[in-house]
Amino acid sequence: KAMHVAQPAVVLASSRGIASFVCEYASPGKATEVRVTVLRQADSQVTEVCAATYMMGNELTFLDDSICTGTSSGNQVNLTIQGLRAMDTGLYICKVELMYPPPYYLGIGNGTQIYVIDPEPCPDSD
């Protein structure tokens, strides 16, 4: 049976350009190695934002230069994307792959619409 992935429909980024959401997957098998990828879809173009592979029971680690951080707990991944600007507003899709042991399973969420509003510049003080 195919794998289902759930994520919130909408998230509003903080004034500091940080957005967090939970990605939950219904694992059909007993995976020991999982890969989580965040994709951004804009105008039917899909790009990879970040990706991390982790062993079940361990923390997931993104590359040092990644704009993503995250924690895992069972079949749930808490994702945080930072450094967002208004132009980054868009649909962010959670993709989960059960890499090992076979069989491989793919799960793709419906996406989380992240809205980013650039903060107003502070007025000059006299």
Partner: antibody, heavy 109, light 102 residues
Framework: GVVEPGRSLRLSCTAS????????MHWVRQAPGKGLEWVAV????????HYADSAKGRFTISRDNSKNTLYLQMNSLRAEDTAVYYC???????????WGQGTLVTVSS | QSPGTLSLSPGERATLSCRAS??????LAWYQQKPGQAPRPLIY???SRATGIPDRFSGSGSGTDFTLTISRLEPEDFAVYYC?????????FGPGTKVDIK
């Protein structure tokens, strides 16, 4: 190329135009006049590989990300392995979004 | 996949079916293949058109039953069409449906 039954052959597929190490890569084959048959996949850094039953034990998929190249080592070849072999990219959304032009392998004595 | 061959005239509507042995959720793609060429993706995720695919191609269905529809056949659409599930390994293809000129 043409190869005798029982012999070995290594196929290669060199990719360009995308970040090779960010994508899974597949081999798919097609026997003359027949349909498409998935053979094997290798993921990202090459640490995970999955095979069709028909390929297990005889075929080995590998990749060299520094050379943007995908390989298929085929051992103990049989007549039924005669096919066009395609490499294909596993797109970000999972489907096979780009395909190579294919290589004809003929196993015959 | 059914039928094995579909004989139609240009301008007609083509309806191709694909049935999975178990639920593949939304991980279902359609590919077109012409003689001597590699397959090219038409539809992914059941109903999303791949890059550059004209809107006369559409996909629908859910669970185990899926359909590819070509609303008005153009001369270049006569080819073999394959469905494929890509959610679980092994990634299986249907046997194909040949759309030929009546």
């Amino acid at each position: 190329g043409v190869v005798e039954p029982g012999r070995s052959l290594r196929l290669s597929c060199t990719a360009s135009g995308f970040t090779f190490s960010s994508y899974g890569m597949h081999w798919v084959r097609q026997a003359p006049g027949k349909g498409l048959e998935w053979v094997a996949v290798i993921w990202y850094d090459g640490s995970n590989k999955h095979y069709a039953d028909s390929a297990k034990g005889r075929f080995t998929i590998s990749r060299d990300n520094s050379k943007n190249t995908l390989y298929l080592q085929m051992n103990s070849l049989r007549a039924e392995d005669t096919a066009v072999y395609y490499c294909a990219r596993a797109g970000l959304l999972g489907y096979f979004d780009y395909w190579g032009q294919g290589t004809l392998v003929t196993v015959s004595s | 996949q059914s039928p094995g061959t579909l004989s139609l005239s240009p301008g007609e509507r083509a309806t191709l079916s694909c049935r999975a042995s178990q639920s593949v959720s939304s991980y279902l793609a359609w590919y077109q293949q012409k003689p001597g060429q590699a397959p090219r993706p038409l539809i992914y995720g059941v109903s999303s058109r791949a890059t550059g695919i004209p809107d006369r191609f559409s996909g629908s269905g859910s669970g185990t039953d899926f359909t590819l529809t070509i609303s008005r056949l153009e001369p270049e659409d006569f080819a073999v069409y394959y469905c494929q599930q890509y959610g679980i390994s092994p990634f299986t293809f249907g046997p194909g449906t040949k759309v030929d000129i009546k």
